[in-house]
Interface confidence: low
């Protein structure tokens, strides 16, 4: 399944596109990547509003949506093995295109701690509510979907494309149509800002007439941080309309000549740029020439300017842009150093947490601490990790190796441990005998007892139960029911499998063990040799953060 087009919003130095289509997070990221972008970041309330706007645009085009909730992937993910960090706004998640741990977040609900599998974030839209600025989409984390499996994927995704700069939309001074083609392969006739390297096709005229003229322009970087189309004067001008059509395409003032011609002009304090349409402030700082957080400082007599950087930044070679000083070069941290804009922060490897002597020190996380253990039974802390173990009669299970599952001794690799009936219990097993036989003291073999038509003998007393390792006592030499009495052929099993709880007495209906008087006795035995109780503890399936449904290959609870 592919992604359908798409809505687009361009603002500042970025464009956001929204797409519908059931894709996994990886497929969505790949789609954005093919056109030079990434799944969108939502690093501030302002950016959340831009993303909401593009989603509103997309949803406006979609046919009526009947699902109450709709989800759209964004570029926030947490890799397998990386645990939740409740102290951070992003909770240990990070943006796919890289970048620092941003302060803005808008989680839908408290996150469940799970390090087992990769988790991805989508924007959750409540389609039953009007999409208003005061209701920004919430962040929902969950499984990342699986390629080629639409049922497990969500409704769409949002991409972000970043640019050096933007051109103003072309202004038409008369009837016509502009079509912009962006570097990320979107065409649109209405962009509030047009990204660098976009092409514009202008078709002048009323549309139904033959006298249409076409123009082609490219959004170029004319000077550092100055982007324009290289056009001069308003486009599609017509004496018929003069200044009456779209203010003649002028940015500020439009002055009409007597012959229907007109000129664009600017208000006091502004000057007309080379395109003869746009007005810019005469103050050199008003065009915001300084980038990357630099402050524009006016020179003497207001003629020129210099850019000044905040602490932790320095000017780059262009003297316009601030670049971050990399404090991590000096290795200030014990384990990991993350350079952030204007500073740095120390991080600890998975399995460690901040602490210990000195700035940026790390100490081992005791995953086995009380109330914290991820293991169902035994937990052993190791330096930077942990491992789980199980009590006798259980083996490690679960995709992450933290659960314990009962061993069914009745179907062990060496065959049944009991001579006759075998009953599996949680963490153990016990043997039983058919009517007319009694359990030998070793708790495994059966010896011939007084003939009886009663039910099979019940579970042995606690001290007679089979040992977990299997009894070392040799089996009794007496005939045992699984082999049948000497000289009688084994009959086809006919009784149903007993379904017994661990300590329930055997109360199945009496088995008719002997044929009518005078004919040789025929032994019948249960068709399934053992009664298996429910398997070991299992994680309940739950909300969208349930680990139980993840497809992981983690085996032993490693972080």
């Amino acid at each position: 399944t592919g992604a359908d087009t798409e809505a687009v919003v361009c603002v500042g130095t970025a464009c956001y596109t929204a797409h519908s289509g059931k894709l996994s997070a990886a497929e969505a990221q790949n789609h954005c990547n093919q056109n030079g972008g990434n799944l969108a970041t939502v690093k501030s309330k302002e950016e959340a509003q831009h993303v909401q706007r593009v989603l509103a645009q997309l949803l406006r085009r979609e046919a009526a949506l009947t699902a109450r909730m709709s989800k759209f992937w964004i570029g926030l993910q947490r890799e397998k093995g990386k645990c939740l960090d409740p102290s951070l706004p992003l909770k240990g998640f990070s943006w796919v295109g890289g970048g620092e741990d941003t302060p803005y977040s808008n989680w839908h609900k408290e996150l469940r701690n799970s390090c087992i599998s990769k988790r991805c974030v989508s924007l959750l839209l409540d389609l039953s509510q009007p999409l208003l600025p005061s209701r920004l989409p919430k962040w929902s984390e969950g499984p990342c979907g699986s390629p080629g499996s639409p049922g497990s994927n969500i409704e769409g995704f949002v991409c972000k494309f970043s640019f050096k700069g933007m051109c103003r939309p072309l202004a038409l001074g008369g009837p016509g149509q502009v079509t912009y083609t962006t570097p990320f392969q979107t065409t649109s006739s209405s962009l509030e800002a047009v990204p660098f390297a976009s092409a514009a096709n202008v078709a002048c005229g009323e549309g139904d007439k033959d006298e249409t003229q076409s123009h082609y322009f490219l959004c170029k970087e004319k000077a550092p941080d100055v982007f324009d189309w290289g056009s001069s004067g308003p486009l599609c001008v017509s004496p018929k309309y003069g200044c009456n059509f779209n203010n003649g395409g002028c940015h500020q003032d439009c002055f009409e000549g007597g012959d229907g011609s007109f000129l664009c002009g600017c208000r006091p304090g502004f000057r007309l740029l080379d395109d003869l349409v746009t007005c810019a402030s005469r103050n050199p700082c008003s065009s915001s020439p300084c980038r990357g957080g630099a402050t524009c400082v006016l020179g003497p007599h207001g003629k020129n300017y210099t850019c000044r950087c905040p602490q932790g930044y320095q000017l780059d070679s262009s003297q316009l842009d601030c670049v971050d000083v990399d404090e991590c070069q000096d290795s200030p941290c014990a384990q990991e150093c993350v350079n952030t804009p204007g500073g740095f922060r120390c991080e600890c490897w998975v399995g460690y947490e901040p602490g210990g002597p000195g700035e940026g020190a790390c100490q081992d996380v005791d995953e086995c601490a009380l109330g914290r253990s991820p293991c169902a039974q035994g937990c052993t802390n190791t330096d930077g990790s942990f491992h789980c173990s199980c009590e006798e009669g259980y083996v490690l299970a679960g995709e992450d190796g933290t659960q314990c599952q009962d061993v069914d001794e009745c179907v062990g690799p060496g065959g049944p441990l009991c001579d006759s009936l075998c009953f599996n219990t949680q963490g153990s097993f016990h043997c039983g005998c058919l009517p007319g036989w009694v359990l030998a003291p070793n708790g495994v073999s059966c010896t011939m007892g007084p003939v009886s038509l009663g039910p099979p003998s019940g579970p042995p007393d606690e001290e007679d139960k089979g040992e977990k390792e299997g009894s070392t006592v040799p089996r009794a030499a007496t005939a045992s029911p699984t082999r049948g009495p000497e000289g009688t052929p084994k009959a086809t099993p006919t009784t149903s499998r007993p379904s017994l709880s661990s300590d329930a007495p055997i109360t199945s209906a009496p088995l008719k063990m002997l044929a009518p008087s005078g004919s040789p006795g025929v032994w019948r035995e249960p068709s399934i040799h053992h009664a298996t109780a429910a398997s070991g503890p299992q994680e309940p399936a739950g909300g969208d953060s349930s680990v139980a449904t993840q497809n992981n290959d983690g085996t032993d609870g490693q972080k």
């Epitope: 406006r60 009947t66 999409l131």
Partner: antibody
């Protein structure tokens, strides 16, 4: 062409309920929200609430919550607005209007209005 | 609730002259670059009719003598050359927050 056709005028006693209908035609009924707006004699416009006709989601002005119920019948492309516990203050012309599905939900098509008079 | 205040309450303008109506919101109705502010015209005995949406976008079929401007909290509807058929009450409306609210209306008459 796109039209919203409303039911006829109603006269009600205080404490009673009134149910006004609005039938849509000329466009895909489920692709637009339907809003209700009222206008008391000589007064301005007051938004009552909206309904999404596809899945019947509703959103009401808090002022009317508990008294207003909006419903729809997809088969006849009709939306209903019921207002209960009427008082003389509820005497007004009630308009239905449609808006786009998302974003700036301006009202681009209006019904002609239904006059509701509440009098003992 | 966002309160929308229109001024003046009524306006008398000569035919062919410019008419200007103001609308002030009690808080900003801008959102991510768009103004969630719409203008309607209502003639006696008729429902309102959409003129301008998102502060400055002319609804299709509306004469281009109508124009809208403004952002944040202050908005203006301008009729560049008043015609006899423009006699009506004009309302502004915000759709940025619930409940959607209207201004009190401005009555435009011919002088």
């Amino acid at each position: 062409q796109v039209q919203l056709v409303q039911s006829g005028a109603e006269v009600k006693k205080p404490g009673a309920s009134v149910k006004v209908s609005c039938r849509a035609s000329g466009y895909t009924f489920t692709s637009y929200w339907i809003h209700w707006v009222r206008q008391a004699p000589g007064q301005g416009l007051e938004w009552i609430g909206e309904i999404e006709p596809s899945a019947s989601y509703t959103y009401y002005n808090q002022k009317f919550k508990g008294r207003v119920t909006m419903t729809r019948d997809k088969s006849s492309s009709t939306v209903y607005m019921e207002l209960s516990s009427l008082t003389s203050e509820d005497s007004a012309v009630y308009y239905c209007a449609r808006s786009v599905y998302y974003g700036n939900k301006y009202f681009d098509v209006w019904g002609a209005g239904t006059t509701v008079t509440v009098s003992s | 609730d966002i309160v929308m205040t229109q001024s003046p309450d009524s306006l008398a303008v000569s035919l062919g002259e410019r008419a200007t109506i103001n609308c002030k919101a009690s808080q900003s109705v801008d959102y991510a670059g768009d103004s969630y502010l719409n203008w309607y015209q209502q003639k006696p005995g008729q429902p309102p009719k959409l003129l301008i949406y998102a502060a400055s976008n002319l609804e299709s079929g509306v004469p281009d003598r109508f124009s809208g401007s403004g952002s944040g909290t202050d908005f203006t509807l301008t009729i560049s050359s008043l015609q006899a058929e423009d006699v009506a009450v004009y309302y502004c409306q915000q759709t940025n927050e619930d409940p959607r609210t209207f201004g009190g209306g401005t009555k435009v008459e011919i002088k």
